[in-house]
């Protein structure tokens, strides 16, 4: 059951009159402009800055008073400022959304350590995985390693956005007091939507006697 709570002074459930709400979008995916209304009888117009008005055709663009405008496969045309407008009792109300295109491009993934990694037993392992992407890309970075089931590693993540051309994502894996069971393959996996890249390195553990 969906209940509308009619409010003549507020046709939109969420109003972003001054600062637009940012909506992340991916080309080819569904995009929802969430200008749902307080009454199903309110007529809403979707405008694209600067000079266009989108026409819901029931096919690619659907109007649903409980959700807003649903664009089944977003294109570059929907990138930018979109405004939902409604006139109630002669008063024009607007709510603004800024669509931000997320790409799924992963430019490069590296583990910044010599390969293979040679380490003394009892010492600390630090592996730094670096993913480089275009500015409007977000990634998920995960690690797989030999003693993963015991959650031996701690992982810290950060992002460097100081570069004007790319985002650099860091995932730093640390394991204290390395033991023989920690030797083996360490893999950093980077995913952005359907895109996927991985990099791995071998870690060898040595006793002091063999150095």
């Amino acid at each position: 059951i969906y209940i509308f709570i009619s409010d003549t002074g507020r046709p939109f459930v969420e109003m972003y009159s001054e600062i637009p709400e940012i909506i992340h979008m991916t080309e080819g995916r569904e995009l929802v402009i969430p200008c749902r209304v307080t009454s199903p009888n309110i007529t809403v117009t979707l405008k694209k800055f600067p000079l266009d008005t989108l026409i819901p055709d029931g096919k690619r663009i659907i109007w649903d008073s409980r959700k807003g405008f649903i664009i089944s496969n977003a294109t570059y045309k929907e990138i930018g400022l979109l405004t939902c407008e409604a006139t109630v009792n002669g008063h024009l109300y607007k709510t603004n959304y800024l669509t931000h295109r997320q790409t799924n491009t992963i430019i490069d993934v590296q583990i910044s350590t010599p390969r293979p990694v040679k380490l003394l037993r009892g010492h600390t392992l630090v592996l730094n995985c670096t993913a480089t992407t275009p500015l409007n890309t977000r990634v998920q970075m995960t690690w797989s390693y030999p003693d993963e089931k015991n959650k031996r590693a701690s992982v810290r993540r950060r992002i460097d956005q100081s570069n004007s051309h790319a985002n650099i994502f860091y995932s730093v894996l640390t394991i204290d007091k390395m033991q023989n069971k920690d030797k083996g393959l360490y893999t950093c996996r980077v995913r952005s939507g359907p895109s996927f890249k991985s990099v791995n390195t071998s870690v060898h553990i040595y006793d002091k006697a063999f150095i």
């Epitope: 009888n41 600067p50 000079l51 008005t53 055709d57 045309k77």
Partner: antibody, heavy 121, light 106 residues
Framework: EVQLVESGGDLVKPGGSLKLSCAAS????????MSWVRQTPDKRLEWVAT????????YYPDSVKGRFTISRDNAKNTLYLQMSSLKSEDTAMFYC??????????????WGQGTSVTVSS | DIQMTQSPSSLSASLGGKVTITCTTS??????IAWYQHKPGKGPRLLIH???TLQPGIPSRFSGSGSGRDYSFSISNLEPEDIATYFC????????FGGGTKLELK
Amino acid sequence: EVQLVESGGDLVKPGGSLKLSCAASGFTFSSSGMSWVRQTPDKRLEWVATITSGGSYTYYPDSVKGRFTISRDNAKNTLYLQMSSLKSEDTAMFYCARLGNYGGYYAMDYWGQGTSVTVSS
Amino acid sequence: DIQMTQSPSSLSASLGGKVTITCTTSQDSNNYIAWYQHKPGKGPRLLIHYASTLQPGIPSRFSGSGSGRDYSFSISNLEPEDIATYFCLQYDYLWTFGGGTKLELK
């Protein structure tokens, strides 16, 4: 008063091309979505093409997709329909219509008087 | 695509009488139904939108109703100027017109 005046209709051979125009006045043309609708000899109405107010989006039924192109010149308050690879079944009266928002979706609310297109050898 | 079945295709009525036309859509049209009057040599005229809402300036003897897939349009107290062809339109999924109903005087 809203006025839509179509022109450009003619007798054309199968496979030929034709460009229809629609001059609009009495409303803010640049803020209105527009459509072309045709009436076939058996008096049935068929939607042919739609364009958004700024011209970024166009819509066509499968029957004309790839053969017809709708466009507009907002500076001249004029709507166009370029028709190519014409077939005898394209013979019709072509109407230009303004779209109005009625409940979130758009219906044709003002129509011109039409221009006649005959495709025959 | 949505199909529209309009009936009857023609209809004879007396002045002062009442006529009803129906349109059935092949899928739920969510009340996005419009009705038009069309006279020879002119463009169609929008009478009703959203199934039952009368356009400004249209006499109240015209009315529309319905929901889901079934919609109807009526003219009561028929007047001479009402003699025309009437069409329904669904505008929920692209645009599809009914086949039309030619209204004649009995």
